[in-house]
Amino acid sequence: GSVPPMVNVTRSEASEGNITVTCRASSFYPRNITLTWRQDGVSLSHDTQQWGDVLPDGNGTYQTWVATRICQGEEQRFTCYMEHSGNHSTHPVPSGNSHHHHHHHH
């Protein structure tokens, strides 16, 4: 059977006026997954995102990540979109005073 990912969105200061938002998916099986940032509901182009490899995490499951740089104050327009085994979920960027959003998608 399939094991749904745990999805975690974090933010970090990148440069003046910019932040990097990172979306990590972990503990999922099988390894096929879609992880991408969306702005105003639409997927960002490939060249504005950085992806990590899908790697085994040592428990027979996998992990990966995607990151993008955005303007500070625009965070709410962005969501991490995850698709795995026919299910999807969306994960917003937390406000500045909180850094984590964990969610099993099904």
Epitope: T34, R38, Q39, D40, G41, V42, S43, Q76, R77, F78, T79, E83, G86, N87, H88, S89, T90, P92, P94, S95, S98, H101, H103
Partner: antibody, heavy 117, light 107 residues
């Protein structure tokens, strides 16, 4: 102009199924998630689930996971919500809506489903 | 699931009145909150998103505020067309949940 046009009212028997359609126009259908919400008479709103029309991937409210099926037809820009094993408590207006990032910006006009023996 | 508690459930007001509706979430929703207006027999109409951003075409007498768990919709000077039911909705996590609604009636 973005428009979501839903199918007409339905009257169904308990135990049967209903399939409501939502035809999108005025935007790229496969780019945005379609959400489904219902509203029982005189009641609040309840989220049923969502579908990515591009891939067919779904996200269901646990409450509806066993009875609701969301599908989409890219060739006709139409999303569907099927609800099975209907009971009287399912009498409600069913809405589709477009998910614009982190809110619903456009809604269908609603489809009244009445479940009655 | 995040519960959304909206108050009051109904209120009576006159044209020109200032009206305030509140919504409290059972957990931090990070300002991922929308407000909708609904009239009988119609679908909800988006008024405010991200807690305080006014949707296109919405009159400036409407405003939203709040953060964390507590949010407010204010109508600065009630107009005849504002008599309707108002709902809040959180978008922080699924299942997306709504407040039970506030019916604004003519006094």
């Amino acid at each position: 102009e973005v428009q979501l046009v839903q199918s007409g009212a339905e009257v169904k028997k308990p135990g049967s199924s209903v399939k409501v359609s939502c035809k999108a126009s005025g935007y790229a259908f496969t780019n945005y998630l379609i959400e489904w919400v219902r509203q029982a008479p005189g009641q609040g709103l309840e989220w049923i689930g969502a579908i990515n029309p591009g891939s067919g991937a779904t996200n269901y409210n646990e409450k509806f996971k066993d009875r609701a099926t969301l599908t989409a037809d890219k060739s006709t820009n139409t999303a569907y919500m099927e609800l099975s094993s209907l009971r009287s408590e399912d009498t409600a207006v069913y809405f589709c809506a477009r998910f614009l990032g982190n809110y619903f910006d456009n809604w269908g006009q609603g489809t009244l489903v009445t479940v009655s023996s | 699931d995040i519960q959304m508690t909206q108050s009051p459930s109904s209120l009576s007001a006159s044209v020109g009145d200032r009206v305030t509706i509140t919504c409290r979430a059972s957990g931090n929703i990070h300002s991922y909150l929308a407000w909708y207006q609904q009239k009988p027999g119609k679908s909800p109409k988006l008024l405010v998103y991200y807690a305080e951003t006014l949707a296109d075409g919405v009159p400036s007498r409407f405003s939203g505020s709040g953060s964390g768990t507590d949010y407010t919709l204010t109508i600065s000077s009630l107009q005849p067309e504002d008599f309707a039911t108002y709902f809040c909705q959180q978008f922080w996590t699924t299942p997306y949940t709504f407040g039970q609604g506030t019916k604004v009636e003519i006094k």
